[in-house]
């Protein structure tokens, strides 16, 4: 009966359009066969969450429809990606990992990873 | 405001039931875990159990299980403790708390006295 | 499951004094370590997160360090609206335990 430990990378750079993704791993203490995985976004100590999945061992993270996240898994690893994002969501993504079913209940939250994001340029006026 | 506000305890003999209420206000119930925890006169804090946001996870103290039942209502932002068997060591204060983004107990009700004697 | 140890039962302060208080586990809740005060007749409230971290609103004279097994809360300056009971609890894992509190009371 351990911590659970949760790896995620610490720093990332969104896309041109506003895609990041990252690797949230994490040491499972128990034989887990549900697991949630939520994104909580810290901004100014302030916590929210960004999206969250619950999924069974060996099948696809299931996303709600309206939800700016996807992602897969892999065992002990999901692959976490972030659509939709602009410079004004640069801040610290946290990947928080709970081991629902069977009991006992297991908490995992990782460091956080900080996610910059550059609007890009708008393309210049062409006069051909 | 974040409120909660326990409801439902009383005397009852041993043996006897009861069921507590917990009215949630002031944010979105249905995104949070629950749950409950007791406080024995003098004594000090005991986790009792714990429900997820959806209900599809529930969890107990050892010291509780087969007797009481947690649940929950989102529709009406409202939390439950069905509590049968009743013995003279569930006597305590129970509150209600609210599972906090990153794990701890973040918002509590004021507690509701719950006897059991005869 | 995991037991936290809360040492001394209580312990006497003078306002303005630093107080520290310990908390130890059976066995290793990483950081998932929670601190609240409760005053007599009230309901708890949360005041250290995560070993380190303070909930919203919550004084920076209340500090809390440590991982693992050893944890430390400290209270830089007491008030006295800070005498009262104060207890560590882990979150890390089913089932949730708390420590059995220690008494800051006035010297």
């Known amino acids: 009966c351990k911590a659970m430990h949760v790896a995620q990378p610490a720093v990332v750079l969104a896309s041109s359009r506003g895609i990041a993704s990252f690797v949230c791993e994490y040491a499972s203490p128990g034989k887990a066969t549900e697991v949630r995985v939520t994104v909580l976004r810290q901004a100014d100590s302030q916590v929210t969450e960004v999206c969250a999945a619950t999924y069974m061992m060996g099948n696809e993270l299931t996303f709600l429809d309206d939800s700016i996240c996807t992602g897969t898994s892999s065992g002990n690893q999901v692959n976490l990606t972030i659509q939709g994002l602009r410079a004004m969501d640069t801040g610290l993504y946290i990947c928080k990992v709970e081991l629902m079913y069977p009991p006992p209940y297991y908490l995992g939250i990782g460091n956080g990873t900080q996610i910059y994001v550059i609007d890009p340029e708008p393309c210049p006026d062409s006069d051909f | 405001e974040v409120q909660l506000v326990e409801s439902g305890g009383g005397l009852v003999k041993p043996g006897g039931s009861l069921r507590l209420s917990c009215a949630a206000s002031?944010?979105?119930?249905?995104?949070?875990?629950m749950n409950w925890v007791r406080q024995a006169p003098g004594k000090g804090l005991e986790w009792v159990s714990s429900?997820?946001?959806?209900?599809?996870?529930?969890y107990y103290a050892d010291s509780v299980k087969g007797r009481f039942t947690i649940s929950r209502d989102n529709a009406k932002n409202t939390l439950y403790l069905q509590m049968n068997s009743l013995r003279a060591e569930d006597t305590a204060v129970y509150y209600c708390?609210?599972?906090?983004?990153?794990?701890?107990?973040?918002?509590w009700g004021q507690g509701t006295m719950v006897t059991v004697s005869s | 499951e995991i037991v936290l140890t809360q040492s001394p039962a209580t312990l006497s302060f003078s306002p303005g004094e630093r107080a520290t208080l310990s908390c130890r586990a059976s066995?290793?809740?990483?950081?998932?370590l929670a601190w609240y005060q409760q005053k007599p007749g009230q309901a708890p409230r949360l005041l250290i997160y995560?070993?380190?971290s303070r909930a919203t609103g919550i004084p920076d004279r209340f500090s809390g360090s440590g991982s693992g097994t050893d944890f430390t809360f400290t209270i830089s300056r007491l008030e006295p609206e800070d005498f009262a009971v104060y207890y560590c609890?882990?979150?890390?894992?089913?089932?949730?335990?708390f420590g059995p509190g220690t008494k800051v009371d006035i010297k």
């Open positions: 708390a609210r599972v906090g983004l990153m794990g701890p107990f973040d918002i």
């Open positions: 995560g070993a380190s």
């Open positions: 066995q290793s809740v990483s950081s998932y």
């Open positions: 002031g944010f979105t119930f249905s995104s949070y875990s």
């Open positions: 429900i997820s946001s959806s209900s599809s996870y529930i």
């Open positions: 609890q882990q979150y890390g894992s089913s089932p949730f335990t």
